[in-house]
């Protein structure tokens, strides 16, 4: 595979990594779909210093990041822990809340006006950010 | 200029298999995502596959999941359909189209000729 | 899957008609929506994305209006060259999905 060395046109770099903010909403399966159609992946948020980063970014509006625990327990879409990982949740979230009447709980996790955490209906069409690492090989399947 | 050309169309039983090619030229070829759209005769277009520009992440239309297989070689600047278990249904012209892009991918702005394929015993 | 319905399904015109074809998605798609329009034998070409926006190269005769759920491809001033099968195609989720085309032919 190829390696990225720099960031794609419209992408913004920050410690190796690079990031794409919306500028319109989707729901979270649409989202990561776009990230993936990227070759990249809903932001996974591992400090304190990417969280101010992105919350600068995105400023106070609702923003899909890379959470969901749509199986289950809480993961990130790439595969980083989120037991031993940073989280930066809104007092008592996530709720799992059922009261919004549209049916099921809350399974995916957004930033919020001030920047921390909550849990919502995946359905519902937020703004999202991309990331993709930079160096990291591009992982090109075998052709058949 | 931006072109596309597809090939590897033609006649093939029901059950069997046939490999779609679509070369590329005048574009940065791994930054640009792309997809198959088809066409049965005298119908509307279906879109088929995307992948990804560096070909990590594929999206099909669930009538072809499991049969179809979209891949890329960027080294050689061409994208393929790989299309197994083929149907009766599965007879259209294949057209290979680039994703257009400005801040968002946007729609399918480059489009080749078609290549037809026939499934037919 | 995003059910995609043009209406009409045809239409008859004559040279310097304005003509109006309508698209409804079956759920919200903002505006992640294109136009294509397509002449016997040949491929597809993206005339409107992002449902208002013009394709670099396509006349300015040609315009997209419309957010959410209803859209609409207008043509100002129908040219000779504009007859032919226009599709509207959302690009808001997988697995992208196209109406079912209208028709433009010559009254």
């Known amino acids: 595979g190829s390696e990225r060395t720099c960031c794609p046109v419209n992408w913004v770099e920050h410690e190796r990594s690079c990031y794409w903010f919306s500028r319109s909403g989707k729901a979270w399966a649409d989202a990561d779909n776009y990230c993936r159609l990227e070759d990249a992946h809903l932001v996974v948020v591992t400090s304190w210093e990417e969280q101010k980063f992105v919350q600068h970014h995105i400023g106070p509006v609702n923003t899909w990041m890379g959470l969901h625990d749509q199986n289950g327990p809480w993961k990130w879409v790439d595969g980083t822990d989120y037991e031993t990982g940073f989280k930066n949740w809104r007092p008592e979230q996530p709720d799992d809340w059922y009261g919004h009447g549209l049916g099921g709980g809350e399974d995916c996790a957004h930033f919020t006006d001030d920047g921390r955490w909550n849990d919502d209906v995946c359905q519902r069409p937020y703004r999202w950010v991309c990331e993709t690492e930079l160096d990291k090989a591009s992982q090109e399947p075998p052709l058949l | 200029e931006v072109q596309v050309l597809e090939s590897g169309g033609g006649l093939v039983q029901p059950g069997g298999s046939l490999r779609l090619s679509c070369a590329a030229s005048?574009?940065?070829?791994?930054?640009?995502?792309m997809s198959w759209v088809r066409q049965a005769p005298g119908k509307g277009l279906e879109w088929v596959s995307a992948i990804s520009g560096r070909g990590g992440n594929t999206f099909y239309t669930d009538s072809v999941k499991g049969r179809f297989t979209i891949s890329r070689d960027n080294s050689k600047n061409t994208l393929y359909l790989q299309m197994n278990s083929l149907r009766a249904e599965d007879t259209a012209v294949y057209y290979c189209?680039?994703?257009?892009?400005?801040?968002?991918?946007?729609?399918?702005?480059?489009w080749g000729q078609g290549t037809t394929v026939t499934v037919s015993s | 899957d995003i059910q995609m319905t043009q209406s009409p399904s045809s239409v008859s015109a004559s040279v310097g008609d304005r003509v109006t074809i309508t698209c409804r998605a079956s759920?919200?798609?903002?505006?992640?929506l294109a136009w294509y329009q397509q002449k016997p034998g040949k491929a597809p070409k993206l005339l409107i994305y992002?449902?208002?926006s013009l394709q670099s190269g396509v006349p300015s005769r040609f315009s997209g209006s419309g957010s959410g759920t209803d859209f609409t491809l207008t043509i100002s001033s129908l040219q000779p060259e504009d007859f032919a099968t226009y599709y509207c195609?959302?690009?808001?989720?997988?697995?992208?999905?196209f109406g079912q085309g209208t028709k433009v032919e010559i009254k």
């Open positions: 992002d449902a208002s």
């Open positions: 759920q919200g798609i903002s505006t992640w």
């Open positions: 189209a680039k994703l257009g892009k400005d801040y968002y991918y946007y729609g399918m702005d480059v």
């Open positions: 005048g574009l940065t070829f791994s930054s640009s995502a």
């Open positions: 195609q959302q690009a808001n989720s997988f697995p992208w999905t």
